[in-house]
Structure formats: C-alpha cells, structure tokens
Interface confidence: medium
Amino acid sequence: MMTGTIETTGNISAEKGGSIILQCHLSSTTAQVTQVNWEQQDQLLAICNADLGWHISPSFKDRVAPGPGLGLTLQSLTVNDTGEYFCIYHTYPDGTYTGRIFLEVLESSVAEHGARFQIP
C-alpha cells in the first residue's frame, strides 16, 4: 500500500528573465527513492537517479540546472514556460508518486508565490 504524500511548492509565479526553483518532497513513507523525473506536460526536463546522478534533457540543458536537492532550477524564464510541471518519484517498493506545480511567468515585476499544497 502506498502511504506516502508529495508536498510541492504549489502554484508559483516568477518574472520573465528570472529563475525559479521547483521543489517536491516525498514524506510519510519508508520507500527508497530510486529516481525523480521532472516533466513539463509530456516533455522530460531532467532526471535524478540514485545510482547515475543527474541528467538534463539536451533541449533544456542551457536553461535548467539540477538542484537544490532533488529539486530543479529553471533559468532565463520566458512566458512560454508558463504551465504545469510534474515531479515523478519512482520508489521501491511503493511505485510511483507524482506531484504537480503550476508556474506562471509574468511580464510584470510583481510575482507572488502561492501556498504549499499536497498531493496524496
């Protein structure tokens, strides 16, 4: 039975040209995290593998940096980066946990961060 929950940074906003950290945290389970995938819609941005380390998708390598931790830093943001991002935790023996973050990239200088929320 999957008992864990994913806590994410929730709905967030950032300024065009700036950077943002996407963070997820898996709690309430003793399962071993073997890999975390970061995806935007159907595109794989990056993976952090327990044995192999980080790999950034070639099409994003200039604008995506690994970390902090299992998180992901998006740089040089554009309005086109607005949308849903998913952290997918592959664990043993539980299986897969998924967290969702919605990022809005704003033209203005006012970018407010939303509250945290959880996805079971």
Epitope: A50, D51, H55
Partner: antibody
Framework: QVTLKESGPGILQPSQTLSLTCTFS??????????VGWIRQLSGKGLEWLAN???????YYNPSLKNRLTISKDTSNNQAFLKITNVDTADTATYYC??????????????????WGQGASVTVSS | DIMMTQSPLSVAVTPGESASISCRSS???????????LSWYLQRPEKSPQLLIF???NLASGVSDRFSGSGSGTDFTLIISKVETEDVGIYYC?????????FGAGTKLELK
Amino acid sequence: QVTLKESGPGILQPSQTLSLTCTFSGFSLRTYGLGVGWIRQLSGKGLEWLANIWWDDDEYYNPSLKNRLTISKDTSNNQAFLKITNVDTADTATYYCARIARPHYYWDGRYILDVWGQGASVTVSS
Amino acid sequence: DIMMTQSPLSVAVTPGESASISCRSSKSLLHSNGITYLSWYLQRPEKSPQLLIFQISNLASGVSDRFSGSGSGTDFTLIISKVETEDVGIYYCMQFLEVPYTFGAGTKLELK
C-alpha cells in the same frame, strides 16, 4: 565504484545447459532504468549481444537465440543470471556481463554497457 | 536487424600519427528524441571492452581526449590522434537504437 564479475562452469558438454552468474556492486537493480546485459565473444571473433534484464523485470533477448536463452536476477544479492540451453561447440566463447541503462530513459547513452566484467571463458566440448 | 559495417578491418599506425575508423549502419540511428544511439568501444589485448564514446561524439568518463567521434544518421567515424602504445586493440562500433543491439565486426589497430 561499479564492478561486475562473471562466473560459469568453464567446460561443459554439448546438449547441456550453460548457467552463468554475474555478481555486481556499485549499483542496484532496484534503481529505476538500470539493467544488466550479457554479451559474448566467440573465440577470435566479434561481439554478440545476448540479453538484458531490467530493474522492472522486463527482459530483452536477441531473437536469433531467444528460444535458448533465459535471463533472471536476484536483486537482493546483486546478481544476474543467464541460462543457455542445448549448448553446442558453437557456443564456446567468453561471456561478459555489463551494466546498462535503458536507452531513451537515459537519452545520451553514457550508461549503455559502460562497465563490463572481466569475462568468463566457456568451452563446449565432448 | 541493423547491420554495422566497419572499415578497415585492420590499420597499422606509426606512434604519434592519427588513425581513422569508419562505421556504417544499415539504418539511421537517429531516434525521434533527437539522440543518435551509436557508441564506440575499445578492447585492448586480453581485456574486456571499454566504452570510449557514446552518442557519436561524447567521451566516456576517463577517456583521453585524443579520441573523437563524428558523423550522423548512418555514417560515423572514430579518430584517434597522436596514437600511443596503449591504443592498440580492436575497436567496435555498436548501435542500441533497437533490439537486438549489434556491433561492427571490429577494426584492429596495430603499431608500425
């Protein structure tokens, strides 16, 4: 440090079943995307890929040998196994195991058969 | 199956000079994700094969930058510059676009 080591019977007779063991360290077959591959090298010849087993128990086989091959793993003991049934003198070769990460999961290929064992010499002779 | 054809079958090189090895696949190795699944391996005498280059031109960890790869689609080249004694062995190209993964027949590099 990633290491792999093959072990086998050394010599066996035609029609017998060849059982090979790959004992590895430095990585786990619990880890998403990882697997162990088996490759053989016929005496003085090139390399022939035989089979892979993946973290999720999926198996890939070389179709030319598929009906004779069985690959398996013992995740807890960091071992992978290959059985070849009904061996013939043509199966005399050095058998290697190697770490492999699933293509398209690890897009740049840096972990495709990136570390190999020392090889196990197998002779089929009557 | 994808056929991998290497040439020449053997090459003799004077230490300090360069060597070039060609590999041709019977089908394009370019995946829809933009990656070309072509690797080069070196098998030194009495040793196991070792990964030299992946994805046409990327050096594997710990490999000398005297090795370089190029090509696209179905035609690939491995160049060894300033050949040294330790470069002697058999070089194999391999495709892992699809199962069964297949190797070239190998190119034996010797010193003059």
